[in-house]
């Protein structure tokens, strides 16, 4: 978002609306409130970065994120017998991704059409609220999952209803917290008509009267409370997890677990490095520059960082893959275009053959329907 120069004629933030008494020129409209952007921001808003690169990334995220998170949610809700805390957190993670990704066709169309929002104020607010809501939900559920993974290694106790209930309670608390912290995004006017470019932007330009200082304080608070603190918890959990796995005895099963844990750690680290850190850092820097200088020199970087933050919806399925046996099975079978039922039938026949031959050489753990927690 960049700061627009607000020149209000009626003290309202209605913009791009042709008033009953307004004069319409040959091909233009008379605006009631006008917002000006600086040339650099205008070049970003009309350039290939926002009209070509962004739609490509968002299309990839939509094409990958929608089916993978959709399948994950279905697996966690209907195909996982035991609802372990890890399953509960991953189901919520998948839901958060889906709620964000379903709006991407509008986002893609917006950027393809030169950053021109034609879908109305309400839809823009929903899109933005869900966009940030997803990012912060992902961070918090990822933190819960990471802490829970460590806890399981420290206390390898069996599944209990109490643990699942605690996980459900924590999940509900996270959704409530995210709903509360994103309220300003739903309340604030996000659509702004830019007469110079003849476009109505959604969140990319903010009116000056919406004190940029408030936006800086808002995103700084979120960066500290909903990014840095959870990031510290996640990092701590994984450092302790690595220590525990190093010191544990090395049999074939624990070696597999360790490899999977390392893959999970690398995936979460990649998510932080690609998605969460650049976006949170640039949100703060961008608004600080607007607050102090009236313009942002990192606008293009900020746009790219926010775009990359959506890749978490594509990276999350890898987390599910490394944590959940059920998701792993369904993902493999989906990619091989096989049904789980067919695989189970194959397993049964293989098992009967194995027992008849008194041989264990066919043993395969990859198709065992189990959930690691």
């Amino acid at each position: 978002t960049i700061q627009g120069t607000n020149r209000s004629s009626k003290g309202r933030s209605l913009i791009g609306k042709v008033d009953g008494t307004s004069h319409v020129t040959g091909k233009g409209v008379t605006v009631e409130t006008v917002f000006s952007v600086d040339e650099f921001s205008a070049s970003v808003l009309t350039g290939k970065l926002t009209t070509v690169f962004l739609p490509i990334v968002y299309t990839i995220v939509f094409v990958v994120g929608l089916p993978s998170n959709g399948m994950a949610l279905w697996v966690f809700l209907f195909r996982t017998k035991k609802k372990h805390p890890a399953v509960i957190y991953m189901a919520n993670l998948a839901l958060a991704d889906l709620l964000s990704v379903i709006w991407f066709p509008l986002k893609i169309a917006y950027h393809i059409h030169g950053n021109n929002w034609i879908y109305g104020e309400a839809l823009c607010n929903v899109l933005i609220g869900f966009f940030y809501g997803n990012m912060y939900c992902s961070i918090l559920f990822m933190t819960c999952l990471s802490v829970q993974r460590y806890w399981v290694i420290v206390n390898p106790m069996g599944h209990s209803r109490k643990k699942a209930n605690i996980a459900i309670g924590i999940s509900l608390a996270i959704w409530l917290l995210i709903l509360l912290v994103t309220i300003p995004l739903y309340v604030v006017k996000q659509t702004i008509f830019i007469p110079a470019l003849n476009i109505t932007t959604c969140h990319d330009v903010l009116p000056e009267q919406l004190l940029v200082g408030d936006m800086f304080n808002y995103f700084l608070s979120l960066a500290i409370g909903v990014f840095l603190f959870p990031a510290f918890l996640t990092a701590s959990a994984y450092v302790l997890m690595i220590r525990m796995l190093r010191s544990s005895a090395m049999d074939e099963n624990s070696e597999k677990k360790r490899k999977r844990a390392i893959k999970l750690i690398v995936t979460v680290l990649a998510m932080y490095l690609i998605c969460f850190t650049p976006s949170n850092l640039l949100l703060v820097v961008h608004y600080f520059l607007i607050k102090s200088q009236g313009q942002s020199h990192v606008y293009a970087l900020y746009i790219v960082a926010l775009c990359l933050s959506t890749l978490n919806s594509c990276i999350d399925p890898f987390v599910y893959y490394f944590v959940s046996h059920d998701f792993r099975d369904h993902a493999k079978n989906a990619l091989l275009c096989r049904s789980v039922r067919t695989v189970k039938q194959m397993q049964v026949s293989l098992t009967s053959k194995k027992h008849s031959r008194k041989s264990s050489s066919y043993s395969s753990s990859s198709t065992t329907v189990k959930t690691s927690y």
Partner: antibody
Framework: QVQLVQSGAEVKKPGSSVKVSCKAS????????ISWVRQAPGQGLEWMGV???????YYAQKFQGRVTITADESTSTAYMELSSLRSEDTAVYYC?????????????WGQGTLVTVSS | EIVLTQSPATLSLSPGERATLSCRAS??????LDWYQQKPGQAPRLLIY???SRATGIPARFSGSGSGRDFTLTISSLEPEDFAVYYC????????FGGGTKVEIK
Amino acid sequence: QVQLVQSGAEVKKPGSSVKVSCKASGFSLSSYAISWVRQAPGQGLEWMGVIWGNGNTYYAQKFQGRVTITADESTSTAYMELSSLRSEDTAVYYCARWRGYKDYPFDYWGQGTLVTVSS
Amino acid sequence: EIVLTQSPATLSLSPGERATLSCRASQNVYKWLDWYQQKPGQAPRLLIYNAYSRATGIPARFSGSGSGRDFTLTISSLEPEDFAVYYCQQHNSGWTFGGGTKVEIK
């Protein structure tokens, strides 16, 4: 070179309208905005309104409903029409070129058109 | 709307002297402030834009400074052709001009 040439002085009766023209040369009207500023005798400068290269317009609250800014790309001319004239509208009216972006000033000005409103 | 207050209203100086003109905004305009020079019977001429950037063809003796609410136009050594009225104008929120400072020969 960049030039803004305005129409000649006008004497108008109260209640009537005046239309001042501003012919641009050395640049394309479609790539720039034209702002209108007026200056009453012995007074300071007062911003009136603007027309962007794409035809969008915006007027100062004080003049809303009385001023209309238009442009004809084919003749590279911008127009400012002020209706319901009163004696206090007696002023020199200037057109000025603006790039249309926040970080740009009014870099070139017309020579001005004196409009006298008198009964 | 943002109000710009220029001071002093009149500045009486001799050629070769240093002129310091002040412009104060009623609220923060960041660096979005320009300075214009106007001679009798002429259109305003852009001197400084965005607080401190000199416009094309403007002599180095003209310099601008400030940001936020307080701005200054400095003419290091007045030339005979510099005696005129100087206006500041902000373009952060609306386009408004200051009342002007007349620089006259002492």
